[in-house]
């Protein structure tokens, strides 16, 4: 009888230990949840406030109509310039109209003066045709003014208010372009 009581007491004690463990785990879990909740709320608030204050273009980008432009502060060859733009979720500048060309050249004059800036234009080695990087042809008024004498691949760049061509392996600044965010307000 005594043995039976002592076994029951041990079982009860074991149950109590298990419950204490469970309670400890629950408390720990609750604390972890609260911390995560705090982090999530902070992150959400952060996201919401940045979304609320968000301009159509990222910091250091210039807006014109539906586009955002980034004028680089470093030199690179054409292909590296393209890679740098893609990392920003953009592509090298694709000039669609005379109005856009005027905006770009006007902005460049204010920012940096007369330097060379790669754009997303390259010449097909076989056909000699100029194409934007998405495969479309530039409008007749937006063809590079001079044909480069380079035997290497030839790419387009902007200087002052002209579109020119050069060996793609030369070092220049570059301009990236992405779509501006539409305001949902």
């Amino acid at each position: 009888k005594l043995l039976q009581v002592s076994t029951i007491a041990m079982q009860q004690q074991e149950k109590l230990i298990q419950q204490e463990r469970a309670l400890l785990n629950f408390t720990e879990w609750k604390r972890s949840c609260a911390l995560q909740m705090k982090y999530c709320q902070a992150f959400m608030q952060n996201s919401l406030s940045s979304a609320h204050n968000s301009s159509p273009c990222p910091n250091n980008w210039i807006q014109n109509r539906e586009s955002c432009y980034y004028v680089s502060e470093i030199w690179s060859i054409w292909h590296t310039s393209q890679e740098n733009c893609l990392k920003e979720g953009s592509t090298l500048l694709q000039i669609e109209s005379k109005e856009e060309m005027d905006f770009i050249t006007g902005s460049l004059r204010k920012i940096k003066g007369s330097y060379d800036y790669w754009v997303g234009l390259s010449q097909d080695g076989h056909s000699g045709r100029w194409l934007w990087q998405d495969g479309s042809s530039p409008s007749p008024g937006l063809l590079p003014a001079e044909r480069s004498q380079s035997a290497n691949q030839v790419c387009g760049y902007v200087k002052s208010n002209s579109l020119l061509s050069s060996n793609c392996s030369t070092w220049k600044y570059f301009i990236c372009e992405k779509y501006a965010l539409r305001s949902s307000v």
Partner: nanobody
Amino acid sequence: QVQLQESGGGLVQPGGSLRLSCAASGRFFRVNAMGWYRQVPGKQRELVAAITNGGQIAYADSVKGRFTISRDSAKNTVYLQMNSLKSEDTDVYYCNAKAAATHLSTVADYWGQGTQVTVSS
């Protein structure tokens, strides 16, 4: 960390077509662009085609008019439709994602294992 799973490579005759797919999975905050690169022996990987999160597209000169890149944003998947294939398109094609793992981290390049495309008669 971003994992990229490629599929669709294989052997095809000149003039034929192939469609490559690449699905991104894992934990990441944002993917700015996805695309396809090919490894030219003795050279760096070179861009074949890329598409940004805003839908802008860039192609290599050699594939313009023949290859088409597209994406399914909901599935984080990018496709490369390769038409009018030539023997010079034979290469290992690597999927690439330019992604940020967290909202604080910088954008890095993530690569797939590569899929072989062989154009031969």
